[in-house]
Interface confidence: low
């Protein structure tokens, strides 16, 4: 239904707190360099304006679109060109081009310092003094570093943050209460960020149809008792919600997501028997809970997939009459039978089925041609299954840090031209798949591993797009989203790469490394490992292990020495010499 004032409508639907939080996220994601105070001022102005529109929808400018209102606000910021360069050119355009321009200038890797968590006591003090401002800072800092973070989910994580602080700040030992809990929220939020970025990439590069296919597969796995019409309705609504969030329409997105949660809770009988617990929760928790609800029990009497999609004499007729519906039904039927497959794999199978019908339905004897299609799925299914087994075995043998190092070597060999920080970040993230997925029951490993890897590799592609340096990476990132992971897995050592010359300073360390937190130490060591591989791309695993063990021993010795500086300056050059010899 049309509203005289869109901003009044959203303010009323969302309530002041959500409205302000979402506007703050939107501004922080568009203008990533502005301070919290600058954004907070804009948010207050927008909120005050929204309130005037609530009081009188026909007041001046209340009928303007949200893009116009928000864009005008952003374009009125002083020193926009000095701080944001060519982004200021967006302000010369009219809507909807202006918003598109803003979206194109979102930076997936902004040059902002890492978000450092304050010390527990200081955090609790500022939280108690003004919880609203404290939460505002959290939303601002996360949103500007993750310009595609799913806004209603970010409100949920802020809620988690708030609850943890409320609980832990009342404890005697605040630090030991806060640290593990906030680490947990941070880990989940980072995974949420890369997953959502993948959804936005799918939408941006391949359109709504591609996202809807993803949604049909995912929803069919989760709700195998829902019929195809129900799944299609949910997929359509979910596509709209994600399109809005990816497009910067955060108020509409949050509002529609709340509507979708409401619909699901009102229609549990036709969707799933597992929703009640989620539906008993307040809004933000409810929507989050529904997004990761456990799979419903599969119906016991599902017929074999072949009946309708291989053996039926009308296959080509049904396909020709309504291609999208027929393929959608295939994806639905296959997915509801396979909660143990990744969405990426299910989409590859649907693509294979589509290609087979395109080819076979044009032939003289279609049934003879497409009759073996299900058997042809076998290699497509075996490949990711083998990937999971191999990698989980390696993870169990090496542990997370060792597994990250193995991946770092592998990916540096595949794409040695990529910058070392990007390779280290990617390897560390890819390596976390072990901890995240390999401990799960067998039937949950494949979907966990492959869909997580796909999301991480999407980030690799986005960073590489900014400064393309590797033909290997360009090749894998140019193809379809679902083929990326198999493409990266299949890459071997880049034979075109000319090894970097050995620079002693790359492997020279100082005593300040001793006081770094464990994570930072690991990053330093992994940076050295990537540089070693760039110097010797064909070094054996044994050679690299020797060097890294020597390096670890050197750090251990010098960090325990009475005179650390002397130890580093005398033992360091010896280490460099030994490294060169070991890799000769």
């Amino acid at each position: 239904e049309a509203h005289k004032s869109e901003i009044a409508h959203r303010y009323n639907d969302l309530g002041e707190q959500h409205f302000k939080g979402l506007v703050l996220i939107a501004f922080s994601q568009y203008l990533q360099k502005c301070s919290y105070d600058e954004h907070a001022k804009l948010v207050q102005e927008v909120t005050d304006f929204a309130k005037t529109c609530v009081a009188d929808e026909s007041a001046a400018n209340c009928d303007k679109s949200l893009h116009t209102l928000f864009g005008d606000k952003l374009c009125a910021i002083p020193n926009l060109r000095e701080n944001y360069g060519e982004l200021a050119d967006c302000c010369t355009k009219q809507e909807p081009e202006r918003n598109e321009c803003f979206l194109q200038h979102k930076d997936d890797n902004p040059s902002l310092p890492p978000f450092e968590r304050p010390e527990a006591e200081a955090m609790c003090t500022s939280f108690k003094e003004n919880p609203t401002t404290f939460m505002g800072h959290y939303l601002h800092e996360v949103a500007r570093r993750h310009p595609y973070f799913y806004a209603p989910e970010l409100l949920y994580y802020a809620e988690q943050y708030n609850e943890i602080l409320t609980q832990c700040c009342a404890e005697a030992d605040k630090e030991s209460c806060l640290t593990p809990k906030l680490d947990g929220v941070k880990e989940k939020a980072l995974v949420s960020s890369v997953r959502q970025r993948m959804k936005c990439s799918s939408m941006q590069k391949f359109g709504e149809r591609a996202f809807k296919a993803w949604a049909v597969a995912r929803l069919s796995q989760t709700f195998p008792n829902a019929d195809f019409a129900e799944i299609t309705k949910l997929a359509t609504d979910l596509t709209k919600v994600n399109k809005e969030c990816c497009h910067g329409d955060l108020l509409e997105c949050a509002d529609d997501r709340a509507e979708l949660a409401k619909y699901m809770c009102e229609n549990q009988a036709t969707i799933s028997s597992k929703l009640q617990t989620c539906c008993d929760k307040p809004l933000l928790k409810k929507a989050h809970c529904l997004s990761e609800v456990e799979h419903d029990t599969m119906p016991a009497d599902l017929p074999a997939i072949a009946a309708d999609f291989v053996e039926d004499q009308e296959v080509c007729k049904n396909y020709a009459e309504a291609k999208d519906v027929f393929l959608g039904t295939f994806l639905y039927e296959y997915s509801r039978r396979h909660p143990d497959y990744s969405v990426s794999l299910l989409l590859r199978l649907a693509k294979k089925y589509e290609a087979t019908l395109e080819k076979c339905c044009a032939e003289a004897n279609p049934p003879a041609c497409y009759g073996t299609v299900l058997a042809e799925f076998q290699p497509l299914v075996e490949e990711p299954k083998n990937l999971v087994k191999t990698n989980c075995d390696l993870y169990e043998k090496l542990g997370e840090y060792g597994f990250q190092n193995a991946i770092l070597v592998r990916y540096t060999q595949k794409a040695p031209q990529v910058s070392t920080p990007t390779l280290v970040e990617a390897a560390r993230n890819l390596g976390r798949v072990g901890t995240k997925c390999c401990t799960l029951p067998e039937d949950q490993r494949l979907p966990c591993v492959e869909d997580y890897l796909s999301a991480i590799l999407n980030r690799v592609c986005l960073l590489h797009e900014k400064t393309p340096v590797s033909e290997h990476v360009t090749k894998c990132c140019s193809g379809s989203l679902v083929e990326r992971r198999p493409c990266f897995s299949a890459l071997t050592v880049d034979e075109t790469y000319v090894p970097k010359e050995f620079k002693a300073e790359t492997f020279t360390f100082h005593s300040d490394i001793c006081t770094l937190p464990e994570k930072e130490k690991q990053i330093k060591k992994q940076t050295a490992l990537a540089e070693l591989v760039k110097h010797k791309p064909k070094a054996t695993a044994e050679q690299l292990k020797t060097v890294m063990d020597d390096f670890a021993q050197f750090l251990d010795t010098c960090c325990k020495a009475a005179d650390k500086d002397t130890c580093f300056s005398t033992e360091g050059p010896n280490l460099v010499t030994r490294c060169k010899d070991a890799l000769a």
């Epitope: 009044a8 303010y11 009323n12 639907d13 969302l14 309530g15 002041e16 707190q17 959500h18 409205f19 939080g21 929204a50 309130k51 609530v54 009081a55 919880p131 609203t132 939460m135 409100l155 802020a158 809620e159 708030n162 609850e163 929760k281 307040p282 809004l283 933000l284 928790k285």
Partner: nanobody
Framework: EVQLVESGGGLVQPGGSLRLSCAAS????????LAWYRQAPGKQRDLVAR???????YYADSVKGRFTISRDNSKNTLYLQMNSLRAEDTAVYYC??????????WGQGTLVTVSS
């Protein structure tokens, strides 16, 4: 969390009026929607009226034109002005707060009896 305390209930004759109040305390900054629900003996709890932080209101059909919901943000108080009361309005009236950062909160309820 948000704590809610209702007051103003009591016995009233058909056609009479009552004003219910609900005082909110705790993390009141996080409240976005306030509402009144009621539960008659042996029945489920039903929404009577709600008001968003933007001031927009909603009323159940059975009370439209007779009841008015309002809020005073400076006092963190919600009100329900009930006019032309009928026997079927007899129920325990509950104050409800939906919050951005916390689970929803309910008051303990105040009894309204309409009888001659």
């Amino acid at each position: 969390e948000v704590q809610l305390v209702e007051s103003g209930g009591g016995l009233v004759q058909p056609g009479g009026s009552l004003r219910l109040s609900c005082a909110a305390s705790g993390s009141t900054w996080s409240i976005n929607t306030l509402a009144w629900y009621r539960q008659a003996p042996g029945k489920q709890r039903d929404l009577v009226a709600r008001i968003s932080s933007g001031g927009s209101t909603y009323y159940a059909d059975s009370v439209k034109g007779r009841f008015t919901i309002s809020r005073d943000n400076s006092k963190n108080t919600l009100y329900l002005q009930m006019n032309s009361l009928r026997a079927e309005d007899t129920a325990v009236y509950y104050c409800y707060a939906q919050s951005t950062w916390y689970p929803p909160s309910w008051g303990q309820g105040t009894l309204v009896t309409v009888s001659s």
